[in-house]
C-alpha cells in the first residue's frame, strides 16, 4: 500500500499572538523514518520541526502524542504566531538511510499559514503651521503592522468622503505591511469646527474600522477685520474710540493703540466674544482727552494675530480752532484702513 502524507488544510488563518495548528497524517508507519516539517520548498526551505528528540523548538509542539507506537498524526502547533511565521509549511516523510542520510520519500501538499495582524490605530497629522481660508493643506494618515496586505483606507470630512488622496502600501519584509495616505483639502472660513477622519478597514477588524482624526481647529487661521468707530464727544471733552476686531481664529491676539505712530497702550485680551462659526470678536475701547490735543491726531489700532504681520486701521481726530471757552475736536474716520501683510 502506497504511503500517503496528508495535509488536510490547504490554508490556515490565525491572528497574530494566537496559536496555529498545522495538520499532517500519514497512512502507514512503514518504511521507518522520521517526519519533519519545513517552511517553504526547494533549496530555500527551512526546517521548522522534527519528530526526532534532542532538538529544541521553542514555540512548536506536536499536537498528538508522537511517542505512541501507532501514531500516525504528526500535526504541530505553533504558539504566539507572528507575521514572520506566514508562509507555506510542508510535512515530509523520510526513510532511514542505509549508508547515506535519511532520504525524503513523500511530502504533504503544503498548508499556507496566513497571519492576521491588526493595523495600528491610524495616526493623522496635519501641516506644521496654520493655513488660511483659500489655501490647500495636506493631512497624512499612517497605520502599521497589518497582514494580509489587502486594506481599505478612506478620508472623510464632516461625514463626506474626500478624493484627491495619494495612498501607498509598503513592507520591509513582506510579512506585515504599512499604509500611508495623504489627502489635500482647501480651507474655507467655516472649517474651524470641521474635522477629517482617516478610516481604515481590514479583515482583522471584523467590520469595525479604526479611525484617526484631526481637527481643523488646530491647523486653520482666520485673520481678523478691523473697524474703528468713535462715540460722540462727552461733556468732559473726551473722545471714545472703539476698535472692533472681528471674525478671527485662534485667540492668540495682541492689540496696540498708537497715537501718531507712537505706542500708547497695549491690550493682551483674555475675554472674547464667540461667533457661531467658531471665530472670535474682540472690542477695545480707547478714551482720548481732546483737550490735550491742539492739532490733528492719527490714532492706529494695530493687531498682531497668531504671530502674523500686524494689521492696522487708522482713524484721524481733527482739531477745531481753539476758542476762549476751550478747544474741541472733530473726528474724521480714515476709511482707507490698510492691512500690512509685509
Amino acid at each position: 500500500k502506497e504511503l500517503k502524507v496528508t495535509q488536510a488544510d490547504k490554508s490556515v488563518s490565525v491572528a497574530a499572538g494566537d496559536s496555529a495548528t498545522l495538520n499532517c497524517t500519514v497512512s502507514s508507519l512503514t518504511p521507518v523514518g522520521p517526519i519533519k516539517w519545513f517552511k517553504g520548498e526547494g533549496q530555500n526551505r527551512s526546517p521548522i520541526y522534527s519528530f526526532i528528540g534532542g532538538e529544541h523548538f521553542p514555540r512548536i509542539t506536536n499536537v498528538s502524542d508522537a511517542t505512541k507506537r501507532n501514531n500516525m498524526d504528526f500535526s504541530i502547533c505553533i504558539s504566539n504566531v507572528t507575521p514572520e511565521d506566514a508562509g507555506t509549511y510542508y510535512c515530509v516523510k523520510f526513510q532511514k538511510g542505509i549508508v547515506e542520510p535519511d532520504t525524503e520519500i513523500k511530502s504533504g501538499g503544503g498548508t499556507t499559514l496566513y497571519v492576521l495582524a491588526k493595523p495600528s490605530s491610524p495616526e493623522v497629522s496635519g501641516p506644521d503651521s496654520r493655513g488660511s481660508p483659500g489655501q490647500t493643506v495636506n493631512f497624512t494618515c499612517k497605520s502599521y503592522g497589518f497582514s494580509p496586505r489587502n486594506i481599505t483606507l478612506k478620508w472623510l470630512k464632516d461625514g463626506k468622503e474626500l478624493s484627491h488622496l495619494e495612498t501607498t502600501i509598503s513592507s520591509k519584509s513582506n510579512v506585515s505591511y504599512n499604509i500611508s495616505s495623504t489627502v489635500s483639502v482647501k480651507l474655507s472660513p467655516e472649517d474651524i469646527h470641521s474635522r477629517v477622519i482617516c478610516e481604515v478597514a481590514h479583515v482583522t477588524l471584523e467590520g469595525r474600522p479604526l479611525n484617526g482624526t484631526a481637527n481643523f481647529s488646530n491647523i486653520i487661521r482666520v485673520s481678523p477685520t478691523l473697524k474703528i468707530t468713535q462715540q460722540p464727544l462727552t461733556p468732559a471733552s473726551q473722545v471714545n474710540l472703539t476698535c472692533q476686531v472681528q471674525k478671527f481664529y485662534p485667540k492668540a491676539l495682541q492689540l496696540n493703540w498708537l497715537e501718531n505712530g507712537n505706542l500708547s497702550r497695549t491690550d493682551k485680551p483674555e475675554h472674547f466674544t464667540d461667533n457661531r462659526d467658531g471665530t472670535y470678536n474682540y472690542t477695545s475701547l480707547f478714551l482720548v482727552n481732546s483737550s490735550a490735543h491742539r492739532e490733528d491726531v492719527v490714532f492706529t489700532c494695530q493687531v498682531e494675530h497668531d504671530s502674523q504681520p500686524a494689521i492696522t486701521e487708522n482713524h484721524t481726530v481733527r482739531a477745531f480752532a481753539h476758542s476762549s471757552s476751550g478747544g474741541s475736536m472733530e473726528t474724521i474716520p480714515d476709511n482707507n484702513a490698510y492691512y500690512n501683510w509685509n
Partner: antibody, heavy 118, light 109 residues
C-alpha cells in the same frame, strides 16, 4: 543529568504479585516514552513493557501480556510495573529505560532484582 | 529464542578493529541500537538509530547498516572494551523491541 532509579524488587512466591517503581530525574519525564527491560541471570536482555509519554498507550510482548501492567504518574516523574501471576521464569534484574523518538533506549537505570521462588 | 541474530563471541587484540554484526530485522520496519554491558552493571547505549552515537560515547564506537544487517565497529580496541554487546531493535510492524542474544567481546593478551 538523566537518572533512573528502580525500586520494589524482592523475593516473591510463584503466583504472587510485585510492583516495581522507577523514579526519573534530569529530563522532562512527561515528554518521553518509557520501557521496562529485564535480564534473567546469565541470559540476555528482554523487553517486557513500553508506555507512551502520556500514558494512554501500552505495549507488551506475548510472554507477559495479561500478567504485567506498565503505568506512569507524570506528576511524580515515576514509572511503574505491576507484575501479577509471577512465574519462576520471571526471575530477573528489571531495568527501566528511557525511549528515544523511535523507541530504542538511550538511558538505563541500575536495575532491581526480582526473584520468584517458593 | 531471540529475533535478532548476532555471534555469541568475538575476540580481538588490543588496537585492532572489532566488528559485531546483527541481522534478522526487516529493513523497512526496523531501527537498531547497540548496548554495552559489563559484568554486574546496567547496559549503556553505544549506538541508536542504526548509526547515532550519544555524546558521551567515544568515537571509536560506530554503527553502520547494509540492508537487513547492522554492524557495530570498535576501532582501536582497548582492554576496557571487554564486555557483552547487545543488538536491540524496534520493530515498527509489531510495536516490539527485540534483542539479539548478545556477543561477548574478548580482548586478547
Amino acid at each position: 543529568e538523566v537518572q533512573l532509579v528502580e525500586s520494589g524488587g524482592g523475593v516473591v512466591q510463584p503466583g504472587g504479585s510485585l510492583r516495581l517503581s522507577c523514579a526519573a530525574s534530569g529530563f522532562t519525564f512527561s515528554s518521553n516514552a518509557m520501557s521496562w527491560v529485564r535480564q534473567a541471570p546469565g541470559k540476555g536482555l528482554e523487553w517486557v513493557a513500553g508506555i507512551s509519554a502520556g500514558g494512554s498507550d501500552t505495549y507488551y510482548p506475548a510472554s507477559v501480556k495479561g500478567r504485567f501492567t506498565i503505568s506512569r504518574d507524570n506528576s511524580k516523574n515515576t514509572l511503574y510495573l505491576q507484575m501479577n501471576s509471577l512465574r519462576a521464569e520471571d526471575t530477573a534484574v528489571y531495568y527501566c529505560a528511557r525511549e528515544t523518538w523511535n523507541h530504542l533506549f538511550d538511558y538505563w537505570g541500575q536495575g532491581t532484582l526480582v526473584t520468584v521462588s517458593s | 529464542s531471540y529475533e535478532l541474530t548476532q555471534p555469541p563471541s568475538v575476540s580481538v587484540s588490543p588496537g585492532q578493529t572489532a566488528r559485531i554484526t546483527c541481522s534478522g530485522g526487516s529493513y523497512s520496519s526496523y531501527y537498531y541500537a547497540w548496548y554495552q554491558q559489563k559484568p554486574g552493571q546496567a547496559p549503556v547505549t553505544l549506538i541508536y538509530s542504526d548509526d547515532k552515537r550519544p555524546s558521551n560515547i567515544p568515537e571509536r564506537f560506530s554503527g553502520s547498516s547494509s540492508g537487513t544487517t547492522v554492524t557495530l565497529t570498535i576501532s582501536g580496541v582497548q582492554a576496557e572494551d571487554e564486555a557483552d554487546y547487545y543488538c536491540g531493535g524496534y520493530d515498527q510492524s509489531s510495536y516490539t523491541n527485540p534483542f539479539g542474544g548478545g556477543t561477548k567481546l574478548t580482548v586478547l593478551g
